[in-house]
Amino acid sequence: DVERTTCPPEKEVHEIDESLIFYKKRELEACVDAALLAAQMDRVDAIPFTYEQLDVLKHKLDELYPQGYPESVIRHLGHLFLKMSPEDIRKWNVTSLETLKALLKVSKGHEMSAQVATLIDRVVVGRGQLDKDTVDTLTAFCPGCLCSLSPERLSSVPPSVIGAVRPQDLDTCGPRQLDVLYPKARLAFQNMSGSEYFVKIRPFLGGAPTEDVKALSQQNVSMDLATFMKLRREAVLPLTVAEVQKLLGPHVEGLKVEEQHSPVRDWILKQRQDDLDTLGLGLQGGIPNGYLILDLSVREALS
């Protein structure tokens, strides 16, 4: 922490300008009034303060706003945003997309994923839901940031907004997030024809249940292997060999390449070897012919 000293009269600060870069850290601490700094935050980003000097300015703002900065200050943080921790950001109430855009621009090229995720979360909370304008801002200024939101926050996305989400925006989404987004996408695209529907729903299929995957297998969609590999393990395991063959169409040959990877590996272990042999791919590891499958969960012997 910077030691407290009294400001010499000749160093008193009446406006935030370039002359402050000549102040030592202790002089900035003693001479810059936090309220003046807050009022003239829009000037700070254009002044070539050093990293260490910015620490002092942040400290001044933290003292002035222990409960979190007002949006009028947040909007003009500029490079000072790079000094903020997720804990700092959690105290903020942000509603303006202009503020979000400004800070996303600043964070570009820096390791700020935790801070950005927290910022986006605060915007969603501040605006009440993840509306179309917010999604449009995220897809334009921070591809992939949508997936930084928790499933709980994503649940506030209205289905009408799903159309604004591009495949690349979902690349980093985990299964729990896709579980939330998939039903919304299904609803949003329900009136589309088969092939058009599949193109739209494909990025969300990591959240699809077995019955929906089975339904797709009846529609000649020719699912690519990359999409198949992103399906939930639980959704793939109950599929029959015939259903997988129909689902993948000409891409079924790719199963051999993915033979050792989940969910293909786990699916193979559940299939009869003679069924797998019908594919002619040389897939190994299925249930040998003549064996009984005991599903202890339902206490039934299946032949």
Epitope: E18, A46, P48, F49, T50, Y51, L54, G78, H79, H110
Partner: nanobody
Framework: QVQLVESGGGLVQPGGSLRLSCAAS????????VAWYRQAPGKEREAVAV???????KYADSVKGRFTISRYNAKNIAYLQMNSLKPEDTAVYYC??????????WGQGTQVTVSS
């Protein structure tokens, strides 16, 4: 990342002059203030001169009347003309913009040694 390359330093006698240059990649200088800083061994880095995007200049008290900062936006170059040099001006000199300084991204600097 912005690349800044400082040059023009050297060994000079007290009372002598040097002209430092700072070349930047991209159009980083246009629309930004540019500053020269120096760091002597064991001391805090300090700003010595700044030129705003409008061309206004400001100087640290210790160099006023001796140093002159200028810029040539079209070529992305900034200069620091140093006259009447003193032993206490000995340091590594760096130039930077607000963005670079804020993220602690600096060039290699150029060594200025004032000694008889």
């Amino acid at each position: 990342q912005v690349q800044l390359v400082e040059s023009g330093g050297g060994l000079v006698q007290p009372g002598g002059s040097l002209r430092l240059s700072c070349a930047a990649s991209g159009s980083i200088f246009s629309g930004n203030a540019v500053a020269w800083y120096r760091q002597a061994p064991g001391k805090e880095r300090e700003a010595v001169a700044v030129i705003t995007r409008d061309g206004d200049t400001k100087y640290a008290d210790s160099v006023k009347g001796r140093f002159t900062i200028s810029r040539y936006n079209a070529k992305n170059i900034a200069y620091l003309q140093m006259n009447s040099l003193k032993p206490e001006d000995t340091a590594v000199y760096y130039c930077n913009t607000a963005r670079g300084a804020a993220v602690d991204s600096w060039g290699q600097g150029t060594q200025v040694t004032v000694s008889s």
